[in-house]
């Protein structure tokens, strides 16, 4: 546990102006209000630690209420360069430029940042999500079109005195929110440049950032209700493990997913759930207020610690991995989707994980901190937990080394 080390000024304490600056919900992402251009144009921007471009809708789109109008900004500069970002499903493309950017409920600074003005997209914007752009907070290595395009956070740190660190508290509601409730609800906090003690309980535990591209970490052990999955730990990180606020689910490599589901099924076998539930296709419902949380196991991920042969564990509850869904057809019940799914690109610790914890992205010290979130949903019997230290040997062997090819095959 390394929370007691001295910190440089400005790194810790209270950041009142930034608390509660996020809105949204896990299924459609968490967004922060930003202003772009002169005079300032206000947009809601998805906070995404799984990508590295600042990209905003810059043309009319049926799912956008508003968009960035470059022609109205006196400070816009065209970089005369296009950018095309394909996803496994969908894509966005646009034109690169720079403009003045600030975060009203963030540090009191304005920075000139690279902006991708999205002119065309497919399966990118989400109907009803209320965000118009994306703030990629990961590293330059995965920026598009290449790593020479400086990400927003790098620009912010270079141009200001803001410390090279941010922290996220994503607050799942624990119940489904309709559109008006989302607009009015608090979704959490993005603390830029520091750590706010009011947002977590207990101690912060840190895991090294393995490589500065995504926020890559190493998982060394997985337990379901305290039972070790007993897999070669390389499988947990095949081909990587990342912390990604832009993903809803906890996504696991195929073999790990199958083993985890088998174990969760066994632990919750007092009820018979349809196959489609484990696939995320069918909802399961209980009479309002009767969800049997106790029949579902807790899930613990052990992460490499900062000290040799030392690890710590983060434990989530079913309140995190069963996502509440509103369906008019079954509105008299409490219905849920299973929010753990299969991945072909490694483990993704998405909102399902992050909603249990206050997560510190300490870029300056190349580490990610976890503490129990002050806003996580729990019951009177169990709570999310961050605990350690545990002795774990040969943790370096748990990392998977992605074969390097001449051509980048990165597909976000």
């Amino acid at each position: 546990e390394t929370d007691e080390e001295p910190e440089e000024p400005g790194r810790r304490g209270s950041f009142v102006e930034m608390v509660d600056n996020l809105r949204g919900k896990s299924g459609q992402g968490y967004y922060v209000e930003m202003t772009v251009g002169s005079p300032p144009q206000t947009l809601n921007i998805l906070v995404d630690t799984g990508s590295s471009n600042f990209a905003v809708g810059a043309a009319p789109h049926p799912f956008l209420h508003r968009y960035y109008q470059r022609q109205l900004s006196s400070t816009y500069r065209d970089l005369r360069k296009g950018v095309y970002v394909p996803y496994t499903q969908g894509k966005w493309e646009g034109e690169l430029g720079t403009d003045l950017v600030s975060i009203p409920h963030g540090p009191n600074v304005t920075v000139r940042a690279n902006i991708a003005a999205i002119t065309e997209s497919d399966k990118f914007f989400i109907n009803g999500s209320n965000w118009e752009g994306i703030l990629g907070l990961a590293y330059a290595e995965i920026a598009r079109p290449d790593d020479s395009l400086e990400p927003f956070f790098d620009s912010l740190v270079k141009q200001t005195h803001v410390p090279n660190l941010f922290s996220l508290q994503l607050c799942g509601a624990g119940f489904p929110l309709n559109q008006s409730e989302v607009l009015a609800s608090v979704g959490g906090s993005m603390i830029i440049g520091g750590i706010d003690h009011s947002l977590y309980t207990g101690s912060l535990w840190y895991t090294p950032i393995r490589r500065e591209w995504y926020y890559e970490v190493i998982i060394v052990r997985v337990e379901i209700n305290g039972q070790d999955l007993k897999m070669d730990c390389k499988e947990y990180n095949y081909d990587k493990s990342i912390v990604d606020s832009g993903t809803t689910n906890l996504r696991l490599p195929k073999k790990v997913f199958e083993a985890a589901v088998k174990s969760i099924k066994a632990a919750s076998s007092t009820e018979k759930f349809p196959d489609g539930f484990w696939l995320g296709e069918q909802l399961v419902c209980w009479q309002a207020g009767t969800t049997p949380w106790n029949i579902f196991p807790v899930i613990s991920l052990y992460l490499m610690g900062e000290v040799t042969n030392q690890s710590f564990r983060i434990t989530i509850l079913p309140q995190q991995y069963l996502r509440p869904v509103e369906d008019v057809a079954t509105s008299q019940d409490d219905c849920y989707k299973f929010a753990i799914s299969q991945s072909s690109t490694g483990t993704v610790m998405g909102a399902v994980i992050m909603e249990g914890f206050y997560v510190v992205f300490d870029r300056a010290r190349k580490r990610i901190g976890f503490a129990v979130s002050a806003c996580h949903v729990h019951d009177e019997f169990r709570t999310a937990a961050v605990e350690g230290p545990f002795v774990t040997l040969d943790m370096e062997d748990c990392g998977y080394n992605i074969p390097q090819t001449d051509e980048s095959t990165l597909m976000t």
Epitope: Q89, E271, K272, G276, G280, L283, C285, D327, A329, T330
Partner: antibody
């Protein structure tokens, strides 16, 4: 209000193919899977398969694996079912349905008639 | 595949009566059974899920019961608008399968 609007009736020749559509509205399209169901007179309901609009993942009834292909266009919130190499056995009413718990919402039906 | 058997193809009843439609699964499906009503020329309408839960807006004269392999849809105080075919469905495992249907006739 959740609605699934299906395309109109089709009269097609044997050996050809047809593409049926199902346009969804009233909910977040990518949050729920879409199923397709076949109904022949006096033969009840047969599940053809399903698609997840968020990533186009599909699962088929083995019986229809070589007959039906499901696709989505999220920009128009529309799911499609392509039926190939049509025979008289494919003459039927086809429904799309939205998942939730079982199939709470159904489209209004598309009649496909295969005739020379 | 799980076979859902509705042994009665037709049932005759009178307005105001109580009628029970049965359905048997070839293997244990827990309570992962739904019931649908289909009127002539219309799409199926969802009535019951999880064997016994009514979908929103479904009149409370429709009641579902059962678990494991034996399921029943009961309509109490039958109304003329209940003239329809009723299908059970298991959604416990792929492939999803339906019963052959029971046509309710009003005397």
């Amino acid at each position: 209000e959740v609605q699934l609007q299906q395309s109109g009736a089709e009269l097609v020749r044997p050996g050809t193919s047809v593409k049926l559509s199902c346009k969804a509205s009233g909910y977040t399209f990518t949050s729920y899977w879409i199923h397709w169901v076949k109904q022949r007179p006096g033969q009840g309901l047969e599940w053809i398969g399903m698609i997840d609009p968020s990533d186009s993942y599909t699962k088929y009834n083995q019986k229809f694996k070589d007959k039906a292909t499901l696709t989505v266009d999220t920009s128009s919130s529309t799911t499609y079912m392509h039926l190939s190499s049509l025979t008289s056995e494919d003459s039927a009413v086809y429904y799309c349905a939205r998942s939730g718990v079982a199939f709470p919402y159904w489209g209004q039906r598309t009649l496909v008639t295969v005739s020379a | 595949d799980i076979v859902m058997t509705q042994s009665q193809k037709f049932m005759s009843t009178s307005v105001g009566d109580r009628v029970s439609v049965t359905c048997k699964a070839s293997q244990n499906v827990g309570t992962n059974v739904a019931w649908y009503q289909q009127k002539p020329g219309q799409s199926p309408k969802a009535l019951i899920y999880s064997a016994s839960h009514r979908y929103s807006g479904v009149p409370d004269r429709f009641t579902g019961s059962g678990s494991g392999t034996d399921f029943t849809l009961t309509i109490s105080n039958v109304q003329s608008e209940d003239l329809a075919e009723y299908f059970c469905q298991q959604y416990n495992s792929y492939m999803y399968t339906f019963g052959g249907g029971t046509k309710l006739e009003i005397k």
